[in-house]
């Protein structure tokens, strides 16, 4: 008998090379075979459970950056007046959540902020829990 | 043929809103359907393996806080004279281990320390390993 | 019918008690039943996917330390002029990658650096993905 295989784990790595002041960061998924999807500049959560979240990047100017998942809830990450980020966190997310950036710069310029090495990774930690597609 | 489902991963999120000087933090599990249990103010480990551990909180006064798992072993986390914590770690835990807090304040008052956003998450990283219930 | 069990997750914990200047750290796997292997002082990657990586240690002198996985690629971790490390990261690794240390000290002596509590943990986060043995 063939031993059971794992169904694919919900995970995604998105990249971002620029962020817009008072908006967010433009995210793209470099791989075609990710198990999670990007829609309207947000990562769509289909499965309930804990997620491991890794966020990295170097910014062309000082900014304040937050990563949200649900209207009316506090951010997953919130960094004030930084020029880089290299953080890891764990959070409980659920079906219908959407993970997206909010960015504010402290300059009078309205130019985009350039990002080097901008990377956001989400990895589901509770396979076997509720999912809806 | 239906693809195999994952059995639930051992994981838990506990909250704590107060800590007692020279004792620990009073932990409660807000969800009924956690796959790990709280007993005598400790999280009970049933499965051997690596665990992802996330610890967060803001404290009403300066304290020293350690998170233990086994008598005679060093702490999983140890923070000296802090007013907040936001840490992630990885540790190998085993059946019969119990994860619990120890707290010391540096004030002459014996009042409880109030905690805002106090959260401890454990997520088993080695399903398929030894478990005993 | 017996519910399906998880096949073992690819994971390993290696220890290191000394590092050689302009070389690396001598790693040993204390457990016989690890699901990943050490070869030529490197951890061999057999499975594609995200890995949770934990790195800890206290050094007998100041050093610069990098953790690499592939020739021509940037390091997984890079620490400059430190006496200790306690870091967690997430990275995408693939079959044929090898995880290894590079160390530089800033003294004119060529003695080994002694390490206390030196530990490197890798845990695969995408079971069900491609593996080759």
């Amino acid at each position: 008998q063939v031993p059971p295989q794992y169904p694919p784990i919900q995970s995604i790595r998105v990249q971002f090379t620029r962020c817009e002041n008072e908006k967010g960061c433009i995210i793209t998924s470099p791989s075609k075979d990710e198990t999670m999807k990007v829609q309207d500049n947000s990562i769509i959560i289909n499965c309930d459970g804990f997620y491991l979240i890794s966020l990295k990047g170097y910014f062309s100017e000082e900014l304040s950056l937050s990563l949200y998942y649900r209207k009316g809830r506090g951010p997953l990450f919130s960094l004030s007046k930084v020029t880089s980020v290299d953080s890891i966190g764990v959070a409980y997310l659920a079906f219908k959540d959407k993970v997206y950036f909010n960015v504010t710069t402290h300059s009078t310029s309205y130019k985009d902020i350039q990002v080097n090495g901008g990377e956001l990774i989400l990895i589901h930690q509770n396979p076997g829990g509720f999912c809806a597609y | 043929q239906v693809p195999p489902q994952y059995p639930p991963i051992q994981s838990i999120r506990v909250q704590f809103t107060r800590c007692e000087n020279e004792k620990g933090c009073i932990i409660t599990s807000p969800s009924k359907d956690e796959t790990m249990k709280v007993q005598d103010n400790s999280i009970i480990i049933n499965c051997d393996g690596f665990y992802l551990i996330s610890l967060k909180g803001y404290f009403s006064e300066e304290l020293s806080l350690s998170l233990y798992y086994r008598k005679g072993r060093g702490p999983l986390f140890s923070l000296s004279k802090v007013t907040s914590v936001d840490s992630i770690g990885v540790a190998y835990l085993a059946f019969k281990d119990k994860v619990y807090f120890n707290v010391t304040t540096h004030s002459t008052s014996y009042k409880d320390i109030q905690v805002n956003g106090g959260e401890l998450i454990l997520i088993h990283q080695n399903p398929g390993g030894f478990c005993a219930y | 019918q017996v519910p399906p069990q998880y096949p073992p997750i690819q994971s390993i914990r290696v220890q290191f008690t000394r590092c050689e200047n302009e070389k690396g750290c001598i790693i040993t796997s204390p457990s016989k039943d690890e699901t990943m292997k050490v070869q030529d002082n490197s951890i061999i990657i057999n499975c594609d996917g995200f890995y949770l990586i934990s790195l800890k240690g206290y050094f007998s002198e100041e050093l610069s330390l990098s953790l690499y996985y592939r020739k021509g690629r940037g390091p997984l971790f890079s620490l400059s002029k430190v006496t200790s490390v306690d870091s967690i990261g997430v990275a995408y690794l693939a079959f044929k990658d090898k995880v290894y240390f590079n160390v530089t000290t800033h003294s004119t002596s060529y003695k080994d650096i002694q390490v206390n509590g030196g530990e490197l943990i890798l845990i695969h986060q995408n079971p069900g993905g491609f593996c080759a043995y």
Epitope: - | G74 | Y58, F59, E61, S84, Q114, V115, N116
Partner: antibody
């Protein structure tokens, strides 16, 4: 500039207690192992106790184990030595010493010392 | 535990070269520090990691370490160098000292 300033030395009776302190400045205190070393009058240097950079790991010479406790407060940049059940033979100048790393025992800077006298 | 052996005293003529030895089992595999203590003063590290001089230590002080012997050399000793000299190594997280050598400058 690097400084280590010890205090707390005094004249004390046998079986008494003292707490020595060492305030550090001029370097990242939390990154380095620290030690206490003593020197009895007219004698050589003697390692007393050491503590690694974040305080998890401590070492003691055999004849002070169970009587002396080394500790540190990285936020206050202060090293401590709690000395209980003091003996006449503990009389010495006590020096606070910085290590080259977070662990290891290789010294690179000494304080000026604080004098402990145990006498009835 | 690990032991370090030093000669109790060494004499040197003014502006001549003095050698102070420190013996220990395979001491060459360990880092050696040399500590100077002028009478009535606190100890000062004059050589660390076998042969490195801290800022402000004169060039006449040098160190070497191999096999079972570490050596402190004072090239052109001056009257102000008259002091006690201790070798020191780290050993399994603790620290070990030699018994000390008193240098007399004649």
């Amino acid at each position: 500039e690097l400084h280590l300033v010890e205090s707390g030395g005094d004249l004390v009776k046998p079986a008494g207690s003292l707490r020595l302190s060492c305030v550090a400045s001029g370097f990242t205190f939390s990154s380095f192992r620290m030690s206490w070393v003593r020197q009895s009058p007219g004698k050589g240097l003697q390692f007393v106790a050491g503590i690694n950079s974040d305080g998890y790991n401590t070492q003691y010479r055999d004849d002070v184990k169970g009587r002396f406790t080394i500790s540190r407060d990285n936020t206050e940049k202060t090293l401590y030595l709690q000395m209980n059940n003091l003996r006449v033979e503990d009389t010495a100048m006590y020096y606070c010493v910085k290590d080259q790393g977070s662990w290891g025992g290789n010294f690179d800077f000494w304080g000026q010392g604080t004098l402990v006298t145990v006498s009835s | 535990s690990y032991g370090l052996t030093q000669p109790p005293s060494v004499n040197v003529t003014l502006r001549e070269t003095a050698h102070i030895t420190c013996g220990g089992d395979s001491i060459g595999s360990k880092y050696v520090q040399w500590i100077q203590q002028i009478p009535g003063q606190a100890p000062v590290v004059i050589i660390y990691k076998d042969r490195n001089r801290p800022t402000g230590i004169p060039e006449r002080f040098s160190g070497a370490n191999s096999g079972n012997t570490a050596t402190l050399t004072i090239s052109g000793a001056l009257a102000e160098d008259e002091a006690d000299y201790y070798c020191q190594v780290g050993d399994s997280g603790t620290s070990v000292f030699g018994g000390g050598t008193h240098l007399t400058v004649l």
